[in-house]
């Protein structure tokens, strides 16, 4: 729990992880009935859309450029003048995907498991991708992984997701380091399949939670 | 574990001042804002405002401005909800609840208010 | 302030049934909306938040849905523990408001 319960809460919907193109709303929630704010990017490129404007309660962003990856913070106020800026909310980052060719996913032992047993996502390109990313569900989840080399050429990342108890649909980017917000194409869907047990959206070992989306590193 | 304790029930006259305590234990409380929540009987949920427990800093909803008072012993871990000039129709359950991103993760038990 | 609309206001069902709780809310609130179940005599409990996140320990027959003004709530094979009052509720932002309540009676 992040602290300071009067500063706005900044989210993304409908995800913070967004493809090259697409659009995403920024909503700058409050508990002090803020009705308008301001929004800015604390890193890399900054986004001219944005600069010296006031937003009512949420703005679409988009159609969405490498440029637009990286971390956003938001300042609730009321519509007075002068205006009086809020502290700044969280920060939120922001995820572009699509940039590079699509890695691959696979299970082991295999994407049907019995309940309780250990399952490891292997995320894998012929590219020299530095991190990969798993995604449960078109959510995002930490951790993110270091790109490994394997004896037959690929680069590889192993993320063990613990004694299976739920299902579910599984997708991976790849990124590079100096650019960790642009992802690639998510990689083709896995379906995990746990038997003996019905799939569930409450957290669990199978389901890393993530409230906020991506978090910085 | 987290809980949140209310005081018990009251029993008060028209005019009188009622003050409901709300003891928060198993987390941090200045970590969180505490909110009150009213249910007359056989009615539902109404929200009433929040405190920031580490400021202090009180806001009301509109139909709650004037006669309430939400306040804090942090040193105790617990809020207080004080209503002045007690009338009929205020007469209900009221509930302390944990906000975490704006809903509400855990309540207290309710303390009964009975003005009569 | 962002109006609630909650349906039906009271419903009777039996046992290994399914049904369905109803919210519309009088704008957009994207996937920010919370549901509780209250017993008689009892606090509310959130069940759902986020519009479909299930709480920790909630049983898997519950299963939040919707987003922008239009949300429900769905519980598979009724069991007797499930009967009582069911609440909506936006957080968007303040002036927080909750719906008028379902009452889920057995038949």
């Known amino acids: 729990h992040e602290g300071g319960q009067d500063k706005p809460l900044l989210s993304a919907w409908p995800s913070a992880v967004v493809p090259r193109g697409g659009h995403v709303t920024l909503l700058c929630r409050s508990r002090l009935g803020f009705t308008i704010f301001s929004l800015y990017k604390e890193d890399g490129v900054p986004v001219p859309e944005l600069y010296n404007k006031i937003f009512w309660k949420s703005i679409l962003m988009g159609p969405v450029t490498p440029a637009h990856a990286g971390t956003y913070r938001c300042r609730g106020s009321h519509p007075r003048s002068p205006i009086e800026w809020s502290a700044p909310s969280n920060p939120l980052v922001i995820v572009v995907t699509g940039l590079f060719g699509k890695p691959s996913l696979s299970a082991q032992p295999g994407p049907t498991v019995r309940t309780g047993e250990n399952v490891t996502l292997s995320c894998s390109s012929r590219s020299s991708f530095d991190m990969y990313h798993l995604s449960r569900e078109g959510r995002a989840h930490e951790p993110r992984l270091p790109a490994v080399p394997s004896v037959d050429g690929t680069f590889q990342a192993d993320f063990p997701l613990g004694p299976a108890t739920h299902g579910g649909t599984y997708t991976c980017f790849s990124s590079l380091h100096d650019s960790p917000y642009e992802w690639s194409d998510p990689s083709d869907p896995l379906l995990v399949s746990v038997t003996g047990n019905s799939s569930s959206s409450s957290s669990s070992p199978t389901e890393p939670s993530s409230k906020t989306g991506i978090r910085r590193h | 574990q987290i809980q949140l304790v209310q005081s018990g029930p009251e029993l008060k006259k028209p005019g009188e001042t009622v003050k409901i305590s709300c003891k928060a234990s198993g987390y941090t409380f200045t970590d969180y804002s505490m909110h009150w929540v009213k249910q007359a009987p056989g009615k539902g949920l109404k929200w009433m405002g929040w405190i920031n427990t580490e400021t202090g800093g009180p806001t009301y909803a509109d139909d709650f401005k004037g006669r309430f008072a939400f306040s804090l012993e942090t040193s105790a871990t617990t809020a207080y909800l004080q209503i002045n000039n007690l009338k009929n129709e205020d007469t209900a359950t009221y509930f302390c609840s944990r906000d975490v991103d704006l809903y509400f993760d855990y309540w207290g038990q309710g303390t009964t208010l009975t003005v009569s | 302030d962002i109006q609630m609309t909650q349906s039906p206001a009271s419903l009777s069902a039996s046992v290994g049934e399914t049904v369905t709780i109803t919210c519309r809310t009088s704008?957009?609130?994207?996937?920010?909306l919370a549901w509780y179940q209250q017993k008689q005599g009892k606090s509310p409990q959130l069940l759902v938040y986020n519009a479909k996140t299930l709480v920790e320990g909630v049983p898997s027959r519950f299963s939040g849905s919707g987003s922008g003004t239009q949300f429900s709530v769905k519980i598979n094979s009724l069991q007797p523990e499930d009967f009582g009052n069911y609440y909506c509720q936006h957080h968007y932002g303040i002036p927080f408001t909750f719906g008028g309540g379902t009452k889920l009676e057995i038949k």
């Open positions: 704008e957009n609130i994207y996937s920010y």
